[in-house]
């Protein structure tokens, strides 16, 4: 999906108002310095591409993030403010359902959500030069 035509300011507002709080809740008990940010993004469409991938695509050691509250609200925001987004997700979700495991908060998942927090922070500051 091409995130170029999304309403970035509304997605940012939804992130600041509620999605960010859900990410913090997920990470509660974890030190903010515990994980290094290794995933980056260069502009807002790119950030959303990376956010979508980390949130909804199962990875080795962490197959469960798509069922978390922050993921549900992220999906809602992208569907509402990115034209045509919900129509593009059908095949991806169908494939994911077959692989999805029961919800377990592993260290790998915590690391992945830490990366997500970094991507969202970058999304919120699009004018900053890439480090």
């Amino acid at each position: 999906y091409d995130f170029t035509n999304c309403d970035f300011e509304k997605i940012k507002a939804a992130y600041l108002s509620t999605i960010s709080k859900d990410l913090i809740t997920y990470m509660s008990g974890t030190k903010s310095t515990e994980f290094n940010n290794t995933v980056s993004c260069s502009n807002r469409p790119h950030c959303l591409t990376e956010i979508q991938s980390l949130t909804f695509n199962p990875t080795a050691g962490c197959a469960s993030l798509a069922k978390e509250m922050f993921a549900m609200k992220t999906k809602a925001a992208l569907a509402i403010w990115c034209p045509g987004y919900s129509e593009t997700q059908i095949n991806a979700t169908q494939a994911m359902k077959k692989r999805r495991k029961r919800k377990v908060t592993t260290n790998k998942c915590l690391e992945q959500v830490s990366q997500l927090q970094g991507l969202w922070r970058r999304f919120n500051r699009p004018l900053l030069k890439q480090q």
Epitope: A14, T18, D22, T25, A76, A79, Y85, I90
Partner: antibody, heavy 121, light 108 residues
């Protein structure tokens, strides 16, 4: 304007199933989570589950242990909630409620009128 | 699951008086995830307050919401006849979504 119109009242026998519909209009049906909430007579509200019509993803309240199935038909902008193995305690008003961002806070912003399901032998 | 406990179950108040409704949450949640709904007999619930303190569209300013963590409050500064109803708090912090048992505000 957003509207959620539910199917009519049902009377069912214990052990049978019921399927309640919720027809949505006035918004992009595929892009919003749809929730189902029930209310037994004189009781509070109980969340049953939700569906994202765009891709069919669902989340359920484990209390219903597989008795509830939520589906959606994008072609008719209709969500369905089916409850099986009915017992008398399932007698309730069943509501559909859209999940949406209001002032960028996420909540159930529009509700159907409710469908009364009576389970009686 | 997060348990929502509302108190009192019934509140008897005279028109013009102040009413304070409490919602206690079993584990700490973000204020953005706590909502209030109003329900009158024979009607569907209506969104009333979003995210602890943001009034839904058309809700009069005599209503206010506050709180954080595990304790939240809905306050009606001067009760009007149309305010007599049941009020439910609800959390959208973790699954399953849960509601409080409701507080019925009735005429004294």
């Amino acid at each position: 304007q957003v509207q959620l119109v539910q199917s009519g009242a049902e009377v069912k026998k214990p052990g049978s199933s019921v399927k309640v519909s919720c027809k949505a209009s006035g918004y992009a049906f595929s892009s919003y989570w749809m929730n189902w909430v029930r209310q037994a007579p004189g009781q509070g509200l109980e969340w049953m589950g939700q569906i994202f019509p765009g891709d069919g993803e669902t989340n359920y309240n484990g209390k219903f242990k597989g008795r509830v199935t939520i589906t959606a038909d994008k072609s008719t902008s209709t969500a369905y909630m089916e409850l099986s193995s009915l017992r008398s305690e399932d007698t309730a008003v069943y509501y559909c409620a859209r999940g949406g961002y209001v002032n960028f806070l996420y909540a159930m912003d529009y509700w159907g009128q409710g469908t009364t399901v009576t389970v009686s032998s | 699951e997060i348990v929502m406990t509302q108190s009192p179950a019934t509140l008897s108040v005279s028109p013009g008086e102040r009413a304070t409704l409490s919602c206690s949450v079993s584990s700490s949640i973000s204020s953005s995830n706590l909502h209030w709904y109003q329900q009158k007999p024979g009607q569907s619930p209506r969104p009333w307050i979003y995210g602890t303190s943001t009034l839904a569209s058309g809700i009069p300013a005599r209503f206010s919401g506050s709180g954080s963590g595990t304790e939240f409050t809905l306050t009606i500064s001067s009760l009007q006849s149309e305010d007599f109803a049941v009020y439910y708090c609800q959390q959208w912090s973790s699954y399953p979504l849960t509601f409080g048992g409701g507080t019925k505000v009735e005429i004294k």
